[in-house]
């Protein structure tokens, strides 16, 4: 099984124990590590952070001790913006320039492939996204030669039904991608006005349309029905939780909220907590399991957080094995307890390790 793990370059800027550099990563934990994100400037793939080249080197030296590890560079992301991707993909010359710039950049910096993180193609971009993938793969095939393995090509795709329908020609893009990471998280957010788990495995008992689509099981099944081969589908598992501020004394699933949860001490983003911050939060909190959805949530005061723990990730891994998927994807290594100092287990990357162990179990 593949265990595809994202690392985010901006995690270096978190304070104190939250700061994560690629040399803190475990070279034997994942089969693939994806560095997020690269930029595109003047139609050429480019660095984003001032010290990306140094960080690329840090990441890729992990392969010196584990030659089986593959590293990919992810281009795009939320801050890149869909419009910029759209302009490049829809123009034949811009697209060719971008595609031609990728292999030299990846080779120079020691990456084994490219991950496309166009979040998200619009309805008009659907065909252009397919063309971009098809032409990128053709370039990778042509560029490969003896002593120079073919570069890998993957894409991170939304798990939302509406986005899947408007953005992706699943059957066509699947032909050209080496694997597809389906982002089976962020199904529920503060915009809903109520509490809810952002990455449930199954549909909730109360879920009516459109909520009946907002779960991992539906998204995976839908992708498979649309023609994604199970052998290329990698299922996303988050090492972060989504939090809410409760608006009343109700604390269950579906309780009213006044907005996102308070920012974490290190991640500093309202409504999001890294797993290592959740471990802190759990001291003195009340933990519940959403039985049908097979995921936990915790409450403390007026704060509510839905997250994944070692038990829920094992359930998810069992599920993806039952569906004969290619493996699991983790967003993100730097949100797990990468130092092993927060979650009281004396174990670095406890969630990702639980996923790895479950994948290896017979």
């Amino acid at each position: 099984y593949k265990l595809v793990c994202y690392y985010t370059s901006w995690s270096q800027y978190r304070e104190g124990d939250g700061s994560c550099f690629p040399d803190a990563l475990d070279r034997f934990l994942c089969t693939h590590i994806i560095y997020s994100f690269a930029n595109i400037s003047n139609d050429h793939i480019d660095t984003w952070e001032w010290n990306d080249v140094t960080l690329y080197g840090m990441l890729n030296t992990l392969k010196n001790r584990n030659p089986n590890l593959k590293t990919l560079l992810s281009v795009g992301g939320w801050n890149f913006g869909s419009q910029r991707f759209s302009k490049i993909a829809s123009n034949t010359q811009s697209r060719r320039t971008f595609i031609k710039s990728v292999p030299p950049f990846l080779r120079t910096h020691g990456f084994d492939g490219l991950d496309l993180a166009w979040l998200y193609p619009g309805r008009r971009d659907k065909q252009h996204f397919t063309t971009l993938i098809k032409e990128m793969k053709a370039e990778f095939i042509k560029e490969a030669q003896p002593g120079k393995k073919q570069l890998l090509l993957s894409a991170a795709l939304s798990a939302g039904k509406v986005t899947i329908d408007s953005s992706y020609d699943i059957a066509k893009i699947s032909q050209h991608l080496d694997f597809i990471s389906i982002m089976t998280y962020d199904f529920h957010g503060a915009w809903r006005g109520t509490t809810g788990h952002h990455s449930p495995l199954f549909r909730g008992q109360e879920d009516a349309s459109p909520d009946r689509f907002s779960n991992t099981d539906y998204a995976v099944g839908y992708m498979l029905r649309l023609g994604a081969p199970a052998s290329k589908l990698v299922m996303g598992i988050p090492t972060f939780g989504r939090s809410f501020t409760l608006a009343s004394s109700e604390t269950g699933v579906g309780a009213p909220i006044s907005g996102p949860g308070i920012p974490g001490r290190f991640t500093k983003e309202a409504g999001t907590l890294a797993y290592y911050e959740i471990c802190d939060f759990l001291r003195g909190a009340t933990v519940h399991r959403i039985l049908g959805q097979q995921v936990p949530y915790a409450t403390k005061g007026n704060q509510w957080v839905g997250y994944d723990d070692q038990e829920s990730v094992k359930s998810k891994v069992q599920y993806l094995k039952d569906r004969q998927l290619a493996g699991a994807m983790v967003w993100a290594l730097d949100l797990d307890d990468f130092q092993g100092s927060f979650c009281g287990q004396d174990l670095r990357f406890p969630l990702t390790n639980a996923i790895k162990d479950a994948l290896a179990a017979t």
């Epitope: 010196n64 120079t108 020691g110 042509k142 560029e143 030669q145 002593g147």
Partner: antibody, heavy 118, light 111 residues
Framework: EVQLVESGGGLVQPGGSLRLSCAAS????????MTWVRQTPGKGLQWVST????????FYADSVKGRFTISRDNSKNMVYLHMNSLRAEDTAIYYC???????????WGQGTLVTVSS | NFMLTQPHSVSESPGKTVTISCTRS????????VQWYQQRPDSAPTTVIY?????PSGVPDRFSGAIDSSANSASLTISGLQTEDEADYYC?????????FGTGTKVTVLG
């Protein structure tokens, strides 16, 4: 500035052995495949062997398979060509070349002459 | 293995244009990139064209590459021929298991 310097050439009898070395500088060595190409005096170029950046995949021309071994030491920025069971037809200038990020070899050494003769 | 066949020699006066062909014996010329190397006497080869049509920095735009899929051949064109262009030129391509050089073409600048 990328520099490749070959050494180890010389006169050897048929059936003998030789080890060529290529010292690389000015590049992130483990990121690039490295190649040996030879040229018989007055004749054309012939690919001999290529090794991937991490050294896990060697490739050989049919004419040298089983006799030549390519290897690399990424900690020393060195690539080697171990040549056994040498034949008269192996006489050539041997060039070390860096695999480009594109499909050509973008830097070459000045070559080292190997003469196989009794 | 496939072969790449080039004309043995071509000659032309300074300022004129020469085109060297490189025909692939089996497999499609378009399925793998073609490179062109220039080798002056007593020197190592240098790349003048890579990936069919691309020129490395420092190579004058008098050098251009092309692919003719119907003839299953690649070509190198040198326009505005200069005395320093006198050299041997080799095309090169590859498949999944080996690299192949062309037979080589000697370009002579007359006069």
């Amino acid at each position: 500035e990328v520099q490749l310097v070959e050494s180890g050439g010389g006169l050897v009898q048929p059936g003998g052995s030789l080890r060529l070395s290529c010292a690389a500088s000015g590049l992130t060595f483990p990121n690039f495949a490295m190649t040996w190409v030879r040229q018989t005096p007055g004749k054309g170029l012939q690919w001999v062997s290529t090794i991937s950046g991490r050294g896990d995949e060697p490739f050989y021309a049919d004419s040298v398979k089983g006799r030549f071994t390519i290897s690399r030491d990424n900690s020393k920025n060195m690539v080697y060509l171990h040549m056994n069971s040498l034949r008269a037809e192996d006489t050539a200038i041997y060039y070390c070349a860096k695999g480009g990020h594109f499909s050509s070899w973008d830097y070459w050494g000045q070559g080292t002459l190997v003469t196989v003769s009794s | 293995n496939f072969m790449l066949t080039q004309p043995h020699s071509v000659s032309e006066s300074p300022g004129k244009t020469v085109t060297i062909s490189c025909t692939r014996s089996s497999g499609s010329i378009a399925s793998n990139y073609v490179q062109w190397y220039q080798q002056r006497p007593d020197s190592a080869p240098t790349t003048v064209i890579y990936e069919d049509i691309e020129r490395p920095s420092g190579v004058p735009d008098r050098f251009s590459g092309a692919i003719d899929s119907s003839a299953n051949s690649a070509s190198l064109t040198i326009s505005g021929l200069q005395t320093e262009d006198e050299a041997d030129y080799y095309c090169q391509s590859y498949d999944s298991s080996s690299y192949v050089f062309g037979t080589g073409t000697k370009v002579t600048v007359l006069g």
